[in-house]
């Protein structure tokens, strides 16, 4: 009798619990910006404040007949999604509605912020528990809903946003590309993109993670018992919505930061067909799909990281990328990847007080990624060491040299554009533990962190025969920190981190002409959280 | 993620014909006008105007009631539709394009975006 | 399996209070609805209210609101049906029924509890 | 409230031959987002509560033997017996569950002729 979206999402030993805060109550809010609701279906009922908050655009057409199931029918299923008492993921939850999208589901970007700043308003003069704002609607980019975003995430507020519905780079959309916002694209009952018509889900770095959107069995409008099924994006940012409702009623202290990365972390892995994004998408869309997390006091203080995608640089010279964490982590690695293999490396810098990762594009490249690798890292003191280049033929060699600091990442730079003269650097974990090596022309960044009980190790994979890439995981218990490919092939596309594994990709033309000898390498740094022990290095 | 991507940016540093006032002569523009890449989902005539982060509260009234005297003065009725204080300051204004080049030469301007559709998914 | 076991046959005065009881067994007792209907000797069925055990939330037929409460408790999965001051009108068979939400309707009931008010 | 009006009020049939029952709801009971008619017939036999036979209309609840079927739409409806048996010798009710408060019909008596 479980609709398999709610088995989807919600493990097993999830279903029949409650979530409430420490004292009893369920104190979470959670503000849905949509059309007007059906306020008195059985699902929500006593659950759901209606504000009187309406800013929507007339409806278009002189033959327009308001008809109030319709007028309420995105909206109530979305509410019942999120805190329906039969369907809802979160199903004690409180919710207010405000009415932003009209009677054919059009809505305006200022109509949206001034939704936004009513919620804002509402927090100052009533500061109640935590606020979740679920946005299931997309226009254009918009740099100003996106500011309106980020500014609310700032108060504490945790935003989830429709990836929207136009097959598309959810990047080029609104507020879905906004990155304090908690991104959500649509999967069905197979774990697959949703298709929707001719278009579906979108897709890309924007896209946090999956949820259930398709054939989502939910409260519909038409009458006080009457149920339906919906799909799309905004279906599936319900979902979300729920689940984040679901574990800040458990613990309200968890901050944005802390729920994306549980977020990520506890969701099922590697199940969506990639095949189905355009190929230059595929390894920027997430391989996500929701589920329930546990609480940390089930899980204990593990490390938790992600990766971050910068926009691509763009094919100019000189172009750079830039890939920012968000305020409350850290940076523990940067890596590049160019699908044409021209790039002259990454680098750590900071940018006012925050640590960015950067890449850089080489003559002649069709331009650059850069790839952060953010993670959570409680009362860390991180700090960037670096070389310049050496001399020719000579190694550069950077250690983390404080004491007590543990090397999480290296990024390697080269100075000259032209490929063929230099070599790749190279990590060399047996001879030199704890540090970043690099050859002729590269200036050398290694990323140091000290932090209670961090440890981390490197792990190495080589791969003398032809491969497009070579991967090495982080065991159980580790955390990948830092990505490399190291030297092998006369050309490398670089390397990047997908969830606990480490992926160095090789250009084809060099596959052809490696000799067995010139193994190309990919070099993880794992890292755990053991808060007893002492920071160190693992051999 | 928030990178300015398929989105249209133009410079609007018109120059100024601002009635010979010192203050408005003396200030070019160096604020942008944005706005949605999907012409279809533009609403032209509609306009948010977003001041910078430190510009205060007085400030932001101040600004909006200066646009309506400028337009004013050159025969345009302006309406202005909202105030923004709590997210950012700003304020949303019904007005003529004709009207963007002075509008981003007010002072505090950092950007204006014209207004468009958000649809539900 | 599951059911719905409702307590025994009452006997009463008019004016006295009556809590009579819909224990469920064997499904999530807090993620499906009880509902209550009368049944009066000879007569059809009535619909008199609904609780959501989860939340206890409650729905009433306009004619027993005011009549009758609904309540639950969820740590022992037992609704109930309760009268502060009977009359011989009340006189009725109750059933307690499970609704299935998605179809909403009575899929499971209990056995019935007939109550008798009479001096 | 949406009343809900049963014809006949008794109904007598031979064994084997068709029993069919009639229900009318004052307001129509199909809604279109998901095109179902929110209506359900249930069978009462003498001293046991009431079994559910159909929903959504016509669909059997599982278990129910095929000679019920139930039809209509929107404010009409039908439950059709197609061979009388001597167990279905029971009073029928249809109900409505689209809205709160929910209602029967004053209930159909099938006897056998």
């Known amino acids: 009798s479980i609709p398999w979206n709610l088995e989807r999402i919600i493990p097993a030993w999830h279903q029949t619990e409650e979530d409430r805060s420490p004292d009893g109550s369920s104190q979470v809010e959670v503000y849905l910006l949509d059309t007007s609701i059906q306020g008195a279906h059985r699902e929500i009922e006593g659950r759901v404040t209606i504000t009187d908050f309406n800013s929507v655009p007339e409806e278009d057409g002189t033959r327009f007949h308001r008809q109030a199931s319709k007028c309420d029918s995105h909206g109530t299923h979305l509410a019942g999604v999120v805190s329906g008492r039969d369907a809802g993921v979160a199903k004690g939850t409180s919710l207010h509605s405000l009415r932003v999208l009209n009677c054919q589901g059009k809505g305006t970007v200022s109509g949206t912020l001034i939704g936004l700043e009513f919620i804002r308003k509402s927090q100052l003069i009533q500061p109640s528990g935590p606020l979740v704002v679920l946005l299931p609607l997309a226009g254009g980019y918009s740099r100003i809903l996106n500011a309106a975003c980020r500014h609310l995430a700032r108060t504490g507020v945790v935003l989830v946003a429709a990836a929207g519905n136009f097959r598309d780079d959810a990047c080029l959309y609104s507020p879905a590309s906004a990155p304090e916002v908690i991104t959500v694209g649509a999967t069905n009952a197979q774990d697959q993109p949703v298709t929707l018509g001719t278009l579906g889900t979108n897709f890309g770095r924007c896209v946090d993670l999956f949820a259930p959107g398709k054939d989502i069995i939910g409260a519909s409008s038409d009458c006080s018992t009457c149920f339906m099924s919906q799909s799309g994006t905004s279906q599936a940012a319900a979902h979300v919505a729920g689940i984040v409702a679901r574990m800040l009623s458990r613990e309200p202290t968890l901050t944005l930061a802390e729920l994306r990365q549980r977020l990520i972390h506890f969701s099922t892995k590697d199940v969506i067909n990639m095949a189905w994004f355009p190929e230059d998408q595929q390894v920027l869309t997430p391989n996500l799909v929701a589920t329930l997390p546990p609480s940390t006091h089930e899980t204990g203080g593990q490390l938790l990281c992600r990766t971050v995608w910068s926009a691509h640089s763009g094919p100019t010279r000189t172009a750079t990328a830039t890939a920012r964490c968000a305020p409350e982590e850290e940076l523990l690695s940067c890596s590049s990847f160019s699908r044409s293999g021209r790039r002259r490396g990454d680098w750590i810098e900071a940018i006012g007080g925050q640590q960015v990762c950067k890449a850089l594009n080489a003559f002649g490249g069709e331009g650059v990624y850069a790839v952060a690798r953010c993670c959570l890292v409680p009362r860390a003191n991180c700090s960037i060491h670096n070389t310049p280049a050496a001399r020719a033929g000579l190694e550069t060699h950077v250690h983390c040299h404080q004491k007590d600091h543990v090397l999480t990442g290296c990024s390697f730079h080269w100075e000259v554009e032209d490929l063929s003269v230099r070599r790749q650097p190279a990590l060399r974990s047996r001879r030199q533990p704890g540090q970043c090596v690099g050859h002729q022309a590269a200036s050398v960044y290694a990323s140091c962190c000290h932090a209670p009980g961090l440890e981390c190790k490197i792990k190495e994979h080589g791969i003398s025969g032809p491969s497009e890439q070579v991967t090495v995981a982080c065991e159980a218990g580790w955390t990948l920190t830092g990505c490399n490919v190291l030297p092998g092939a006369s050309l490398t596309l670089g390397a990047y981190s997908v969830d606990n594994l480490c992926v160095a990709r090789v250009h084809d033309t060099a596959r052809a002409d490696r000799t067995s000898g010139e193994a190309t390498v990919a070099a993880a740094i794992c890292c755990r959280s053991r808060p007893s022990a002492k920071a160190s290095w693992v051999q | 993620q928030d990178e300015d991507g398929d989105y249209e940016e133009l410079m609007l540093a018109l120059p100024s014909q601002e009635d010979g006032l010192a203050d408005e002569a003396a200030h070019v523009a160096t604020a942008t006008f944005r706005r949605c890449s999907k012409e279809a989902w533009r609403l032209p005539g509609t306009y948010i105007v977003v001041l910078m982060e430190e510009t205060q509260r007085l400030q932001i009234e101040q600004t909006a009631h200066r646009l309506q005297t400028r337009a004013a003065r050159r025969g345009y009725v302006i309406k202005v539709l909202h105030i923004f204080y709590d997210l950012f300051p700003g304020f949303l204004v019904k007005m003529s394009s004709d009207l963007l080049g002075l509008a981003l030469k007010l002072p505090h301007v950092e950007y204006i975006e014209e207004d468009s559709f958000v649809f539900a998914q | 399996q599951v059911q719905l076991v409702q307590s025994g046959a009452e006997v009463k005065k008019p004016g006295e209070s009556l809590k009579i009881s819909c224990k469920g067994s064997?499904?999530?007792?807090?993620?499906?609805?009880i509902s209550w209907v009368r049944q009066m000797p000879g007569k059809g069925l009535e619909w008199m209210g609904i609780?959501?055990?989860?939340?206890?939330?409650?729905n009433y037929s306009p004619s027993f609101q005011g009549q009758v409460t609904i309540s639950a408790d969820k740590s022992i999965s037992t609704a109930y049906l309760q009268w502060s001051s009977l009359k011989a009108s009340d006189t009725a068979m109750y059933y307690c029924?499970?609704?299935?939400?998605?179809?909403?309707?009575?899929?499971?009931w209990g056995q019935g509890t007939l109550v008798t008010v009479s001096s | 409230d949406i009343v809900m009006t049963q014809s006949p009020d008794s109904l007598a049939v031979s064994l084997g031959e068709r029993a069919t029952i009639n229900c009318r709801s004052s307001q129509s009971v199909l809604y279109s987002s998901n095109n179902k008619n929110y209506l359900a017939w249930y069978q009462q036999k003498p001293g046991q509560p009431p079994k559910l036979l159909i929903y959504w209309a016509s669909t059997r609840e599982s278990g129910v033997p095929d000679r019920f079927s139930g039809s209509g739409s929107g404010t009409d409806f039908t439950l059709t017996i197609s061979s009388l048996q001597a167990e279905d010798v029971a009073v029928y009710y249809c109900?409505?569950?689209?809205?709160?408060?929910?209602?029967f019909g004053q209930g159909t008596k099938v006897e056998i002729k």
């Open positions: 064997g499904y999530s007792f807090t993620n499906y609805w």
């Open positions: 029924a499970r609704d299935y939400w998605y179809k909403p309707l009575f899929d499971i």
């Open positions: 609780i959501y055990p989860g939340d206890s939330y409650t």
């Open positions: 109900q409505q569950y689209s809205s709160f408060p929910i209602t």
